[in-house]
């Protein structure tokens, strides 16, 4: 007959595993002794190996639950093509029987005592239940037996008292608007919400319990801009050293707007960041010397000659100046105290002259007195002799400029009855008053 052929036999459970297929003979399936077969689906699984006894099954339950009974177990001859020990064919069962005792004695029912008194009502107000109990001891059950029925019974009871209503909170109300519009000010901004003890309110008679917990909650506001912080001056810094070594100077103190620094649009510190003081060294300052104006040129002379006037003979002349006002170790005057030049003397020399053009108008004189006038002149100007403008006095020292010196006696044709100077005067018009400008400001 054809069988179902499997690739494995599971020793522990006696089951076929890994179905290869059906419609094959036992002989063909068992060409591989590791295989196993079933004659029908769900039937007994036989391995293809040579027959041997399976493990003993577990003991079956004891035939009775109390006092002495007996129990069975079995094993099976499994395999193909041969016999198990004792010349037993495959598929045969072998049994074992043993005595057993789950519980020595059998349970015996007990009997109830009479009912006890009713317990107080389960509540102190409105309606509840009350209970009474009885004991399973008349007689007591044996060997795990019990009494039939209930050990307690209950019935409704009415206290004839109205129950108090305990308070319960209603839901929280909305958060109030923030107590400030910015954070960092004198008061921390907070928002508040509250709830009422009204869901329900506690009863007055009989008195109910008030709501447990808190009715108000506060929390810090978030998302607010920082409050503006006005700037504050820090302390004045040290006075700077006097910047001068003599006379009066000016020292300075500085302070910084950082106590606190203005923040978040707060105003800058009012007032000045610096202040000055006069400092006095009590030391007079050095005064540098200054040259007076040059003195007059000395007469133009030539050594060893009595006079060179009105002659084409160069001479020499000098002028001096004085260094005045040097005090308290001030600098001496720079430069030469004496100036020397070469000259032609035309002192008192009669020279042909010519009238100059009109000079520009002079200043109005007197400037603050009555009837000021201005004047201009034409002068009889001498025509200087055509002497060489440079001379070489000492060989190797190069050419030196030569200057005409002295007051000649120019001769011009008479002009408007004058020989030397013709003057024209005019009054000054619309003359303003002389006033001290400082007094004018007052």
């Amino acid at each position: 007959d054809p069988v179902l052929c499997f690739t494995q036999y599971e020793e522990s459970s006696g089951k076929c595993k890994g179905l290869l297929g059906g419609g094959v003979s036992v002989e063909d399936c068992c060409l591989n002794t590791a295989f196993a077969y079933q004659k029908r689906s769900g039937g007994l699984c036989q391995p293809c190996r040579s027959p041997r006894w399976s493990l003993w099954s577990t003991w079956a339950p004891c035939s009775v639950t109390c006092s002495e009974g007996s129990q069975l177990r079995y094993r099976r001859c499994v395999g193909w093509n041969g016999q198990c020990s004792g010349k037993v064919a495959p598929g045969t069962l072998e049994w074992q029987l043993q005595a057993c005792e789950d519980q020595q004695c059998c349970p015996e029912m007990g009997g109830w005592s009479g009912w006890g008194p009713w317990e107080p009502c389960s509540v102190t107000c409105s309606k509840g239940t009350r209970t009474r109990r009885r004991a399973c001891n008349h007689p007591a059950p044996k060997c795990g037996g019990h009494c039939p029925g209930q050990a307690q019974e209950s019935e409704a009871c009415d206290t004839q008292q109205v129950c108090p209503t305990h308070g319960a909170w209603a839901t929280w109300g909305p958060w109030t608007p923030c107590s400030a519009s910015c954070h960092g000010g004198p008061h921390e901004p907070k928002e508040t919400r509250s709830r009422k003890c009204s869901a329900p309110e506690p009863s007055q008679k009989p008195p109910g319990k008030p709501c447990p917990g808190l009715a108000y909650e506060q929390r810090r506001c978030t998302g607010l801009p920082p409050c503006p912080v006005a700037g504050g001056w820090g302390p004045w810094g040290p006075v700077s050293p006097c910047p001068v070594t003599c006379g009066l100077g000016q020292t300075m103190e500085q302070r910084t707007c950082n106590h606190p620094v203005p923040q978040h649009g707060g105003p800058f510190c009012a007032g000045d960041a610096t202040r000055t003081h006069i400092c006095n060294t009590a030391v007079p300052c050095p005064v540098d010397g200054e040259w007076d104006s040059w003195g007059e040129w000395s007469p133009c002379i030539r050594r060893n000659m009595k006079s060179i006037s009105c002659q084409e003979i160069p001479g020499q002349q000098s002028r001096g100046r004085t260094c005045r006002g040097r005090k308290f170790d001030g600098h001496r005057c720079a430069g030469q105290q004496q100036d020397i030049r070469h000259c032609y003397s035309i002192q008192h020399c009669p020279l042909k002259g010519s009238w100059s053009e009109w000079s520009t108008w002079g200043l109005c004189m007197p400037p603050c007195g009555p009837n000021p006038t201005r004047a201009r002149q034409r002068l009889c100007t001498p025509l200087l002799p055509k002497y060489p403008p440079t001379v070489s006095m000492v060989e190797g020292q190069g050419e030196k400029n030569v200057t005409f010196w002295g007051r000649p006696l120019p001769r011009c044709e008479e002009l408007q009855g004058q020989k030397l100077v013709v003057e024209e005067k005019r009054p000054c018009l619309h003359v303003p008053a002389c006033k001290d400008p400082e007094e004018e400001e007052l």
Epitope: P212, G213, L214, E217, Q218, R219, R220
Partner: nanobody, 122 residues
Framework: QVHLVESGGGLVQAGGSLRLSCTAS????????VGWFRQAPGKERELIGV????????GYADSVLGRFTISRDDVKNTVFLQMDSVKPEDTAVYYC???????????????WGQGTQVTVSG
């Protein structure tokens, strides 16, 4: 184990002010929400206020709102109850207590102080 000690109680005139302190030792008060309770003679212990761990949230009972303020100074390891405009009915033993989580309900607190007496004379 946090040990809480209340101080600052005493006798005060009605309308006056008092500041109670709750100082922690053996732990950091900044790790806990702190509640203030009071118990008047013959009455149940009442929760009157609570402050959260970071001080961002506070809760108050109806009876003290606007008069009492709770604040905390974690550097000093102390929580304060500032009592202003006190009334004779504020007479009680005041307790502070600490728990891990902030709640404005009546919930169990893990650590309790021994209490400080406040008496308001009429």
């Amino acid at each position: 184990q946090v040990h809480l000690v209340e101080s600052g109680g005493g006798l005060v005139q009605a309308g006056g002010s008092l500041r109670l302190s709750c100082t922690a030792s053996g732990g950091t008060v900044g790790d806990y929400a702190v509640g203030w309770f009071r118990q008047a003679p013959g009455k149940e212990r009442e929760l009157i206020g609570v402050v959260s761990r970071l001080g961002a949230r506070t809760g108050y009972a109806d009876s003290v709102l606007g008069r009492f303020t709770i604040s905390r100074d974690d550097v000093k390891n102390t929580v304060f109850l500032q009592m202003d405009s006190v009334k004779p009915e504020d007479t009680a033993v005041y307790y502070c207590a600490a728990r891990r989580d902030y709640s404005f309900e009546v919930v169990p607190y893990d650590y309790w102080g021994q209490g400080t007496q406040v008496t308001v004379s009429g």
